[in-house]
Amino acid sequence: LQDPCSNCPAGTFCDNNRNQICSPCPPNSFSSAGGQRTCDICRQCKGVFRTRKECSSTSNAECDCTPGFHCLGAGCSMCEQDCKQGQELTKKGCKDCCFGTFNDQKRGICRPWTNCSLDGKSVLVNGTKERDVVCGPSP
């Protein structure tokens, strides 16, 4: 037998106790699929989060991060502070990349320069804190 609740569209919830009646989601809640027993509370983008897409009765709000921060995790579950290129974020804040490492983004960690000699090549352009070395032709 087909579940009568499957007739309830997105934007509504189905109350099993009342003969599978479809009721509209209350304000600031949503159901993104049909046949749901409850509506979920809309995500609120507060503090360091900002609203990228408003909530509706059929879809949750989507957040991103305020300037100076970037998203981490599925669905931007966290905001992490940006650093400058040539830096990485540590527990003590943004720190310059150590010699021999670089970071060309505002996020992530410093990575070692490419070792050109491993590929039998020479260094064409030296690396910096912001840029990897450029390997040239074999010496």
Partner: antibody, heavy 114, light 107 residues
């Protein structure tokens, strides 16, 4: 900001027809179900009809079933109410509202009289 | 259909007084009750949803309470701009139904 603007009201003779429109802006219209609610002069609010976001589900009040048809055009962000076999008791201010019933339009007045 | 009964039909108040409006449902509607304010020649505005949640931008002098069949809207200190009709409505099941309204007037 969210805006709902009804139009199409006016004077109609009993037995006549009329189509109301509701132009929506300031929100993602295609993601919301929509209602029509009416208010007779000096009376309370009466829910008329509901249409889901994708038009798959439609409900009507018993008082209008078989005479009124609710529809929507998501491409044009517009809600409609086609009314036929109009009666004097359909005289009211007609409002459209989102399915959260949080925003209402300013209303359009329909008078059914000979 | 679920019948929503509001009382009183009208009440006269002085600025600063505490106002309590009542709404009773003919059957259990959980907490799916909203309160609306309607000023003359204007459309209704949502004040309270889910029986007790204040909608965005609504002053905190407006408070909703209740569940199941008995609901209350309280205005802690009525202001001149609060003079209006107040409607309760249930969204627990279709058809959505509303009370006949309570008219709040100045003494």
């Amino acid at each position: 900001q969210v805006q709902l603007q009804e139009s199409g009201g006016g004077l109609v003779k009993p037995g006549g027809s009329r189509k109301l429109s509701c132009a929506a802006s300031g929100f993602t219209f295609s993601e919301f179900g929509m209602h029509w609610v009416r208010q007779a002069p000096d009376k309370g609010l009466e829910w008329v009809a509901y249409i889901s976001s994708g038009s798959s589900t439609i409900y009507y009040a018993d008082t209008v079933k078989g005479r009124f048809t609710i529809s929507r055009d998501n491409a044009k962000n517009t809600l409609f109410l086609q009314m036929t076999s109009l009666r004097s008791e359909d005289t009211a201010m007609y409002y459209c509202a989102r399915d959260w019933v949080d925003y209402w339009g300013q209303g359009t007045a329909l008078t059914v009289s000979s | 259909n679920i019948v929503m009964t509001q009382s009183p039909k009208s009440m006269s108040m002085s600025v600063g007084e505490r106002v309590t409006l009542s709404c009773k449902a003919s059957e259990n509607v959980g907490s799916y009750v909203s309160w609306y304010q309607q000023k003359p020649e204007k459309s209704p505005k949502l004040l309270i949803y889910g029986a007790s949640n204040r909608y965005t931008g609504v002053p905190d002098r407006f408070t909703g309470s209740g569940s199941a069949t008995d609901f209350t809207l309280t205005i802690s200190s009525v202001q001149a701009e609060d003079l209006a009709d107040y409607h309760c409505g249930q969204s627990y099941s279709y058809p959505l139904t509303f009370g006949a309204g309570t008219k709040l007037e100045l003494k």
